[in-house]
Interface confidence: medium
Amino acid sequence: SAPGEDEECGRVRDFVAKLANNTHQHVFDDLRGSVSLSWVGDSTGVILVLTTFHVPLVIMTFGQSKLYRSEDYGKNFKDITDLINNTFIRTEFGMAIGPENSGKVVLTAEVSGGSRGGRIFRSSDFAKNFVQTDLPFHPLTQMMYSPQNSDYLLALSTENGLWVSKNFGGKWEEIHKAVCLAKWGSDNTIFFTTYANGSCKADLGALELWRTSDLGKSFKTIGVKIYSFGLGGRFLFASVMADKDTTRRIHVSTDQGDTWSMAQLPSVGQEQFYSILAANDDMVFMHVDEPGDTGFGTIFTSDDRGIVYSKSLDRHLYTTTGGETDFTNVTSLRGVYITSVLSEDNSIQTMITFDQGGRWTHLRKPENSECDATAKNKNECSLHIHASYSISQKLNVPMAPLSEPNAVGIVIAHGSVGDAISVMVPDVYISDDGGYSWTKMLEGPHYYTILDSGGIIVAIEHSSRPINVIKFSTDEGQCWQTYTFTRDPIYFTGLASEPGARSMNISIWGFTESFLTSQWVSYTIDFKDILERNCEEKDYTIWLAHSTDPEDYEDGCILGYKEQFLRLRKSSVCQNGRDYVVTKQPSICLCSLEDFLCDFGYYRPENDSKCVEQPELKGHDLEFCLYGREEHLTTNGYRKIPGDKCQGGVNPVREVKDLKKKCTSNFLSPEKQNSKSN
C-alpha cells in the first residue's frame, strides 16, 4: 500500500479540533500583484510582508505597495504602510534584513526620474518604526550589511561608485569610483574590482582587485588582470588573465590578498567559467567548465590551502555561466552533497557523496518503488533527484531538495526511479539517514517544509486548481494526516515557515479570486497542540551517522571521526521545542589512506588508494606557484583531507621529494602590489 495508508499508521488524536483552534486567516486589503515576505530576526515572530501592484498606464507604469507587519509568526498582520509614508518600495531590491538579531531593516524606495539620489527607509527596532533617508546616489544594488557590524553598509551606485555608511545608512560616503563588484570580507574588510578604461564589461580581464580594511581611509591593490573574484570560507579567489593568451587561471589567497598562490586547476578560455559550488573554512568545491558548449564540467575538491585540487566528479551538469547546477549541500548530515551528471547519452543522473567529494555513487533505489521506463533492467535502477535544473526546465517540480541542520539525517526531494531523471510527473522521496536510503513519501509533486526540527513535516499538493487541504506527518513522513484549513479553496502560491525549521507555525499563502477582484490571503497554522508535550529523554534514541555495517569497528567513520546523535524516535509525538540543540557525540577514528589526498604532482590510479607520482611531471619543473615566490616545494605525496580528524592508523610516509618548480604567474606576487590612502 502507499505510504500513509498502512494499518499501523497511528492517528494523531482529535487533530482537526486542535488545528482548527490554531488556524488564523488574514485577508490582505490588496489587489493581487506580487508579494514578498521576510523574517526579521530569529525567534522574534516578526514578519514583514510587502505587496506591490503595478498599474500599466499609457505613458508610464504606476506602482503601489503596501507594507504589513506581524509579530506573532503570521497569525495577525497590521498595515504599517503609513510608517514609510505610503511610498512605493522597489521589489527588485527586496527587504534588506540585518544579520543575526540586529532588528535592522532597509527598504529602498522608488523615486521620480529627476531626483538627485535614491531614498531608503531604515528601521533598527524590528520594523516598529522607520526613518526616511535621502541618498546622495542612486543605488544599483541592495544595501549590503557587514557580517561583523550591522551599522556598516555598502552599496554600488548606478554610476559605479562604491558607497559606504558607518551609521546604518544615516550618512553615506563615496569611497571609490569605477567599481564593478564589491563584497564584504571578514573583519569589516571590503574587496572590490575597479576598471580603468571604459566600463566593467570592456575591462573584463583587465580589472584591478582592491582591498580596504578601514572602510575607505586607505586601500591596497591586491591583484591585476582580474576577470572576477569570489570569497568562500577563509579563501579569496581571483580569476586572472594569463600573460600570453586569453585563458585565465584561478589564484587563491588565505591572508586577505597579501599573498597569492596559483590553484592547481585547469585554465579556462573565454567561453568557459569557474564556479565555487561550496566552501567552508576547511576546503572548497570548485566547478571547472569544459571547453565548448557542453553544459558540463568537472568538480575539483581542494586541500586545506585551496591550492592543490583533486578531481572529484566528471561530467558535472552545469549549464552556461550563471546557469543551473543541481549541486546541493545536504545540511542535515556532515559530508553529504548531491548533484547531477550528464551522461554520454545526454541523460541526467543523480550522484551523491558521503565523504565531502571523495567518492560519488548513485542513490540507492527506494524499497517501496518500481523502476520506471528509463530503466533497462527493471530490477536495477537508482533514485534520481530533481533540483534547480529540472525547475529551470519547467518540469512539474515545485521545490528543490530540502534539508535542515537541526533535523538530523532528513532529506526531502522530488525524484524518479530509473536509469536517469525522467520527465514524467515526479513523486516526493524522503531519506532519514542523510541520503543512504530513501522511501517514497508522497505521490505526485508537493510543496514541503520541516517544522520543530523534524518533529513535523508539512506538505501541500502542487496543483493548478485551488486547494484547501494541508498534509502533515509526525513520524518523518511515514504516515500522513490531512487537514482542511478553509472551506473556500485558494489559489496556492507558497508555504512560509521561519528559517531554521524550529518553528511550529506554517503560513499558507495564496489568493482568492472572485468575479470582481482578487486578494492576497494567508492561513497560519500552529501545530503546538498536535505535539502536546515536551520531548523527554525516553523519546530519543542513539543513531550512528554514516552507519553501513553496525558491527564493523570503522562503521560511521567519515573524515576521520564518527558522530552519534540523539534522534527523536519516529513513534514519539512530542515537541523538540524552539531551544532544541542537536546532541551529537564525536569520536576519533584511526587513519586510513582514504583520509589523505594526493599532494601536488601525485595522483591516485583507479581502484588504488596509494598516491603515485604523475608520470608527465617526473623530472620536470612543475608549473606551480606557491605564494608567488621562487621556492622548492617539499612533499611526501600525501596531504590530510581538509577537516579530517583521524589519529594514528596509517601514516603514509615516503621519502620527501624536493619538487623544483618555476613560477609561471607571479603578477599577483607581493612586490607587484601597492597601497594608497585617501
Epitope: D552, Q564, K584, G649
Partner: antibody
Framework: EVQLVESGGGLVQPGGSLRLSCAAS????????MSWVRQAPDKRLEWVAI????????YYSDTVKGRFTISRDNSKNSLYLQMNSLRAEDTAVYYC???????????WGQGTLVTVSS | DIQMTQSPSSVSASVGDRVTITCHAS??????IGWLQQKPGKAFKGLIY???NLKDGVPSRFSGSGSGADFTLTISSLQPEDFATYFC?????????FGQGTKVEKR
C-alpha cells in the same frame, strides 16, 4: 557465549621479547576492532594498542610505540601483541578487549601476567 | 593526552546505600565515556557506555550521567554483588585513558 582468552604471558628479562595471543569465540571476530589494555601492579589501567577490524590500521600509546606490534589473524579468530625491548615498567596483567563502533571496551578476557625482571 | 581524574579512590558502604563515583576529564569529551567493573579473579565487565547508556544485562540500579568533562556513576541501592572496583574510560581521542579506579568496599 562471547569469550576472549589471553595466553603467552610469563617472566622475561629486560630487553627480552614476548608474544601474547588472544583467542576469540562466540562472535564475528573480523568485524570488531580489538585492543590490548594492561593493568600495572598498582592497579592502574593503561590502554596499549588498538587494531581495526580488517587489520589495516593500528594505533599505539606513546609508552610502547616502536617496541610493541599489534596484529590479528581473522581466519584464526586471533589477536596478537608482539612485545620487544621489554622494560621493568611493562610488568602488568595484559587484557585483550573488544571494540564495536558503539562501545569501545565491551568484552574483556581474564588477562595474562607479564613480568619483566632480571 | 586526556587525563581522567576519578574520585574517591575508595568508598565504604553498606548494602542498600546509594554510591556515587565521579570522573573529571582534563578536556571536553562529549559523552565518550564508559564505566567498567572489576572483581578479583573475574574479567572486566562493561556497565555503561556513552556516559548514560546501560549495557544489556546490567541492572537498572546502575546509572551514568554527565556530559562534557564531568561524569558520574551512581549505584542507587548497593547490592552484595556490587562490591568491586570501578573504572571510567574515555574514548573520544587516542590514546584512550582510564581513571585511577574507585574501590567500593564493605563498611
Amino acid at each position: 557465549e562471547v569469550q576472549l582468552v589471553e595466553s603467552g604471558g610469563g617472566l622475561v628479562q629486560p630487553g627480552g621479547s614476548l608474544r601474547l595471543s588472544c583467542a576469540a569465540s562466540g562472535f564475528t571476530f573480523s568485524t570488531y576492532g580489538m585492543s590490548w589494555v594492561r593493568q600495572a601492579p598498582d592497579k592502574r589501567l593503561e590502554w596499549v594498542a588498538i587494531i581495526s577490524s580488517g587489520g589495516s590500521y593500528t594505533y599505539y600509546s606513546d609508552t610502547v610505540k616502536g617496541r610493541f606490534t599489534i596484529s590479528r589473524d581473522n581466519s584464526k579468530n586471533s589477536l596478537y601483541l608482539q612485545m620487544n625491548s621489554l622494560r621493568a615498567e611493562d610488568t602488568a596483567v595484559y587484557y585483550c578487549s573488544r571494540s564495536s563502533s558503539h562501545w569501545y571496551f565491551d568484552v574483556w578476557g581474564q588477562g595474562t601476567l607479564v613480568t619483566v625482571s632480571s | 593526552d586526556i587525563q581522567m581524574t576519578q574520585s574517591p579512590s575508595s568508598v565504604s558502604a553498606s548494602v542498600g546505600d546509594r554510591v556515587t563515583i565521579t570522573c573529571h576529564a582534563s578536556q571536553g569529551i562529549s559523552s565518550n565515556i564508559g564505566w567498567l567493573q572489576q572483581k578479583p579473579g573475574k574479567a572486566f565487565k562493561g556497565l555503561i557506555y556513552h556516559g548514560t547508556n546501560l549495557k544489556d544485562g546490567v541492572p537498572s540500579r546502575f546509572s551514568g550521567s554527565g556530559s562534557g568533562a564531568d561524569f558520574t556513576l551512581t549505584i542507587s541501592s548497593l547490592q552484595p554483588e556490587d562490591f568491586a572496583t570501578y573504572f571510567c574510560v574515555q574514548y573520544a581521542q587516542f590514546p584512550y585513558t582510564f581513571g585511577q579506579g574507585t574501590k567500593v568496599e564493605k563498611r
